[in-house]
């Protein structure tokens, strides 16, 4: 009998460890948003960029949506967020309007509920681009640990938006949740 | 017999928790490399950066392999990659050709299966560093979340190597795993 | 009996379950700390930050402590760490000293238990910020995986602290923990 | 066709001064780092100076430092040698040169112009 | 300053011959060396950089080879254009030296 109960027991137990193991480790939301540069916005102020890929290159989404241009919550928790932007111009692109450039990135969470958005990280450089060079390049990277609650958004604003690298492996964000909320 | 059951379970329950515990805190692959300075190529173009320290200072790997200037995913899951790249120049460095440089650097992914290479993350700016400063100091820092599979590589690409800041705190890169694959 | 000893099991394999879920996820330590702005020190050399908030706005902290300017670790693991630093400068503030600056950021370990302080990353750039453009602006962002041990103590030092941008946006630093030490 | 023409060369006499010119065409000037390097008569080749694209470098070996200034026009795609204080061991034929593409600290020449001859005796 | 010894200081070849030229370098200069032909009253003209590297529509049978101190050039196949003297650089670090040279004559 005891026996019998203690085989039982560790098949059972077993199930329930992989289910614990599959639950904790495979149900943890994230996104790796990516730019679509077929629809960048033009203008040199703050923009919110709306338009990114989660289903193709590096762009890939779980347990959270996206939606309207918006990385939008399904489960609380703390989530590390990060993004990279890249800016660039080429003289073969025409001339720039002014040499004295304000390149900036803010990642914001709206919170629906309480109609609301805030910015949670800010990043970016003021920067002379100079017709001595025939190329300029710049990348701002941001990251941090925020939590989250359901049905909140993340998205992204940036500064001169027809100046971003329209790359996959330059201009992207994502989130990853890290832990549950106490 | 129910008593000793009980308690039976509880003992076994117990080393399993122990043991479901062990196998996701512990055995998670991470790495953090450190650049050699003793091994920095030279060159202005796009350069693999092969000399790294994985095991002094705050060099660390586990569960992941580094080999042939390569870190080496042992374990199929979703990532983060991150990298800091330090530049420097000093007026006692050498005899710097150019104030117009590229700074930048290229986390890469390399499929053995399927030779192919891709870069993941990019980073860097354009620089004036003029000859009317004794020194210049240059940061890039890029992260991104991403799915690897075993076998498959990452290293990482520079431009201007021989402008690498050598210490382990200004040139390093790493990884670690966050979750498993669906 | 079988049947008794199995509902009472699943009964007590869910607790386990629940307590295993809760500790790993829930006791996992993580700060995210924001710059006080209401105290930043003067000075254009290395400066050590040692006011910043923990509990409002973004800033946040659990398991871990703050004191002394200084994020305390409570619990071994591996953690990843990151900072923000943002630096500005408005005409309407006044002149610069000099137009050569050198804006930099090191996040630092110190061990009480043996003495000593460690740069774990540095980040940051030469920046000429000329009188010709009336604002000026620069981000330093750093992140990296580390081994810690309960005791340790993380801290920010920065150059030319007076320049710093004052948003809990903008200069923050964090960490949280991935995993424990083997 | 990419082009260096040096012109500046002549007799001079000792503790005198010389300007030399080079012209470049063909090329984007600005974008490269200059050299002259000299050739003594039956003798090897010497580095003389460099500057580097943008002009706010300079450098030379001690046997010339203080005496030969080099600098650059790149609005007028000029590079120059001025050189004071001559003495009899500089007589030789000055070669303008431009540094090839190549990592930041290294110096080649892979274009050089014909050669401007300098003389210095009393 | 490095000093580059370069070695012989004249050789006399047939045509169809294998030339080597060897250079040495005071101290370690890695594979920072290029190669010169000038031909009497004429510039220099780039032959190889960083040891190995031939330049731009350079004839295949030169080549460079060697690392740290000790470099060597080689004409797999003298011809009678490579009349000339040639010139070992190192581009390690400033001061820019040169060999001595080596002239080039054919028997």
């Known amino acids: 009998g005891s026996q019998h109960i203690r085989a039982e027991k560790a098949m059972v137990d077993g199930s329930w460890l992989d289910l614990a193991k599959r639950s904790k480790l495979e149900a943890q939301p994230f996104a790796h948003l990516t730019i679509n540069a077929t629809d960048i916005p033009s203008g040199s102020h703050k923009v919110s960029l709306s338009s990114w890929y989660h289903d193709r290159g590096w762009g890939k989404i779980s347990n959270m949506t996206f939606s309207n241009g918006k990385l939008i919550v399904n489960q609380d928790g703390f989530y590390y967020l990060y993004a990279n932007i890249c800016f660039r111009h080429h003289e073969t692109s025409g001339d720039l309007a002014t040499e004295y450039l304000q390149l900036m990135v803010y990642v914001t969470k709206t919170s629906i509920k309480i109609p609301s958005s805030h910015t949670l990280m800010k990043g970016g450089s003021t920067k002379y681009w100079s017709g001595n060079s025939e190329f300029h390049f710049y990348s701002i990277n941001v990251g941090g640990f925020f939590k989250l609650r359901s049905g909140e958004e993340i998205s992204i604003e940036v500064s001169n938006p027809s100046l971003l690298d329209p790359d996959q492996d330059a201009t992207y964000f994502g989130a990853f949740k890290v832990r549950d909320i106490d | 017999g129910s008593q000793h059951i009980r308690a039976e379970k509880a003992m076994v329950d117990g080393s399993w928790l122990d043991l479901a515990k062990r196998s996701k805190l512990e055995a998670q692959p991470f790495a953090h490399l450190t650049i050699n300075a003793t091994d920095i190529p030279s060159g202005s173009h796009k350069v693999s950066l092969s000399s790294w320290y994985h095991d002094r200072g705050w060099g660390k790997i586990s569960n992941m392999t580094f080999s042939n200037g390569k870190l080496i995913v042992n374990q199929d899951g979703f990532y983060y990659l991150y990298a800091n790249i330090c530049f420097r120049h000093h007026e006692t460095s050498g005899d710097l050709a150019t104030e117009y440089l590229q700074l930048m650097v290229y986390v890469t992914k390399t499929s053995i299966k399927i030779p192919s290479s891709h870069t993941l993350m990019k980073g860097g700016s354009t620089k004036y560093w003029s000859g009317n400063s004794e020194f210049h100091f240059y940061s890039i820092n890029v992260g991104g979340f991403f799915k690897l599979r075993s076998g498959e590589e990452i290293s990482i690409e520079v431009s201007n190597p021989s402008l690498l800041d050598p210490d382990q705190d200004a040139t390093y890169f790493g990884a670690f795993k966050v979750r498993d694959i669906d | 009996g079988s049947q008794h000893i199995r509902a009472e099991k699943a009964m007590v394999d869910g607790s386990w379950l629940d307590l295993a879920k809760r500790s790993k996820l829930e006791a996992q330590p993580f700060a995210h700390l924001t710059i006080n702005a209401t105290d930043i020190p003067s000075g254009s050399h290395k400066v050590s930050l040692s006011s910043w908030y923990h509990d409002r706005g973004w800033g946040k902290i659990s398991n871990m402590t703050f004191s002394n300017g200084k994020l305390i670790v409570n619990q071994d693991g591996f953690y990843y760490l990151y900072a923000n630093i943002c630096f500005r400068h408005h005409e309407t503030s006044g002149d610069l000293a000099t137009e050569y600056l050198q804006l930099m950021v090191y996040v630092t370990k110190t061990s009480i238990k043996i003495p000593s302080s460690h740069t774990l990353m540095k980040g940051g750039s030469t920046k000429y910020w000329s009188g010709n453009s009336e604002f000026h602006f620069y981000s330093i962002n750093v992140g990296g995986f580390f081994k810690l041990r309960s005791g340790e103590e993380i801290s920010i030092e920065v150059s030319n602290p007076s320049l710093l941008d004052p948003d809990q946006d903008a200069t923050y630093f964090g960490a949280f923990k991935v995993r424990d030490i083997d | 066709e990419v082009q260096l023409v040096e012109s500046g060369g002549g007799l001079v006499k000792p503790g005198g001064s010389l300007r030399l010119s080079c012209a470049a065409s063909?090329?984007?000037?600005?974008?490269?780092?200059m050299s002259w390097v000299r050739q003594a008569p039956g003798k090897g080749l010497e580095w003389v100076a460099g500057?580097?694209?943008?002009?706010?470098?300079?450098y030379y070996p001690d046997t010339v430092k203080g005496r030969f200034t080099i600098s650059r026009d790149n609005a007028k795609n000029s590079l120059y040698l001025q050189m004071n204080s001559l003495r009899a061991e500089d007589t030789a034929v000055y070669y303008c040169?431009?540094?090839?593409?190549?990592?930041?600290?290294?110096?080649?020449?892979?274009?050089w112009g014909k050669g401007t001859t300098v003389t210095v005796s009393s | 300053d490095i000093q580059m010894t370069q070695s012989p200081s004249s050789l006399s070849a047939s045509v169809g011959d294998r030339v080597t030229i060897t250079c040495k370098a005071s101290?370690?200069?890695?594979?920072?060396i290029a190669w010169y032909q000038q031909k009497p009253g004429k510039a220099p003209k780039l032959l190889i950089y960083?040891?190995?590297y031939r330049y731009t529509g350079v004839p295949s049978r030169f080549s460079g080879s060697g690392s740290g101190t000790d470099f060597t050039f080689t004409i797999s196949s003298l011809q009678p254009e490579d009349i000339a003297t040639y010139y070992c650089?190192?581009?390690?670090?400033?001061?820019?030296?040169f060999g001595g040279g080596t002239k080039v004559e054919i028997k």
């Open positions: 960083s040891a190995s």
């Open positions: 040169a431009r540094r090839d593409y190549g990592d930041v600290y290294e110096w080649y020449f892979d274009v």
């Open positions: 500057i580097s694209s943008g002009g706010t470098y300079t």
């Open positions: 101290q370690d200069v890695r594979t920072s």
């Open positions: 063909g090329f984007t000037f600005r974008n490269y780092a």
């Open positions: 650089q190192q581009h390690y670090s400033s001061p820019w030296t």
